[in-house]
């Protein structure tokens, strides 16, 4: 049940990431740690790296408010279930600084890929016989 709540939150975050991708030119073009090909059991650690990253609005044009609201939603902490498990994995997973830094567009694409990977793992774990490769 707790894990389900997490994954539902991940699905909502995908929509927010997709919205932010539309405003990528209005984001500060800063390079941010962007985990990719995250090893098994380090997904939550990588997720927290994405949340900690200083994604910022460039404060230009009419989109500043919607961008700031979306960034705030991305950074909202998930429910505290499994927090202990996440903490345990963090000890053996790469530090945020060790991940390759990418500009906002690639940062958001990698964040989305991680969210999708986590949801897919969750979906597959509840199912038998449809995974092909």
């Amino acid at each position: 049940q707790g894990q389900d709540r997490h994954m539902i939150r991940m699905r909502q975050l995908i929509d927010i990431v997709d919205q932010l991708k539309n405003y990528v030119n209005d984001l500060v073009p800063e390079f941010l740690p962007a985990p990719e090909d995250v090893e098994t059991n380090c997904e939550w650690s990588a997720f927290s790296c994405f949340q900690k990253a200083q994604l910022k609005s460039a404060n230009t044009g009419n989109n500043e408010r919607i961008i700031n609201v979306s960034i705030k939603k991305l950074k909202r902490k998930p429910p505290s279930t499994n927090a202990g498990r996440r903490q345990k994995h963090r000890l053996t997973c790469p530090s945020c600084d060790s991940y390759e830094k990418k500009p906002p567009k690639e940062f958001l694409e990698r964040f989305k890929s991680l969210l999708q990977k986590m949801i897919h793992q969750h979906l597959s774990s509840r199912t038998h016989g449809s995974e092909d490769s």
């Epitope: 049940q1 389900d4 699905r11 997709d18 999708q116 597959s124 509840r126 995974e131 092909d132």
Partner: antibody, heavy 117, light 107 residues
Framework: QVQLQESGPGLVKPSETLSLTCTVS????????WGWIRQPPGKGLEWIGY???????NYNPSLKSRVTISVDTSRNQFSLKLSSVTAADTAVYYC???????????WGQGTLVTVSS | DIQLTQSPSSVSASVGDRVTITCRAS??????LAWYQHKPGKAPKLLIY???SLQSGVPSRFSGSGSGTDFTLTISSLQPEDFATYYC?????????FGGGTKVEIK
């Protein structure tokens, strides 16, 4: 805005292989999940399967032995092959994108495939 | 496989009416349910995901609720462009499955 367009023969003979292609525009096929859903005449929607940006596939167990979904990133296309078709495979076939992994946010308009000799 | 049963199978309503469609799952699916609108010859359109989240660009007159096995799609004030068939889909486990559809017709 992502747009999808199905293409392929509208008529396939029994026991042959149905082949459809979905062309994606307005977005890259190198991310997200790309699926096929069908609707036989007068019936409901049936998920056939999908392929991820990384190439991993999931198929409906009821069709798994006959289905292959593949992706061609250079052409921004993905394809469906359904072997050994029968009249029961007559349907409107839709291709769709799944950003959320398990729901479909963009669909093609569908193409009718009739299986008949 | 998880079966989804939609009711009613069709409903006649007028512009401005409040329309409610229900979807019942054969087993608990938490909030993993999506709703689609489908018009003949057109591409189906995602309205709601994870039971109650409104897809970007969808009018706020559409809302979804429920969890576990019982779910509802509500159109608060039916508009002329809302006459269509609506489908629910479970996103909880493979194979992904759809409900049988509810046709919303003009009274």
């Amino acid at each position: 805005q992502v747009q999808l367009q199905e293409s392929g023969p509208g008529l396939v003979k029994p026991s042959e292989t149905l082949s459809l292609t979905c062309t994606v525009s307005g977005g890259s096929i190198s991310s997200d999940y790309w699926g096929w859903i069908r609707q036989p005449p007068g019936k409901g929607l049936e998920w056939i399967g999908y392929i991820s940006y990384s190439g991993s596939t999931n198929y409906n167990p009821s069709l798994k032995s006959r289905v292959t979904i593949s992706v061609d990133t250079s052409r921004n296309q993905f394809s469906l092959k359904l072997s050994s078709v029968t009249a029961a495979d007559t349907a409107v076939y839709y291709c769709a994108r799944s950003a959320g992994v398990a729901d479909f946010d963009f669909w093609g308009q569908g193409t009718l495939v009739t299986v008949s000799s | 496989d998880i079966q989804l049963t939609q009711s009613p199978s069709s409903v006649s309503a007028s512009v401005g009416d409040r329309v409610t469609i229900t979807c019942r799952a054969s087993q608990g699916i938490s909030s993993w349910l999506a709703w689609y609108q489908h018009k003949p010859g057109k591409a189906p359109k995602l309205l709601i995901y994870v039971a109650s989240s409104l897809q970007s660009g969808v009018p706020s007159r559409f809302s979804g609720s429920g969890s576990g096995t019982d779910f509802t799609l509500t159109i608060s004030s039916l508009q002329p462009e809302d006459f269509a068939t609506y489908y629910c889909q479970q996103a909880s486990s493979f194979p992904l499955t759809f409900g049988g559809g509810t046709k919303v017709e003009i009274k």
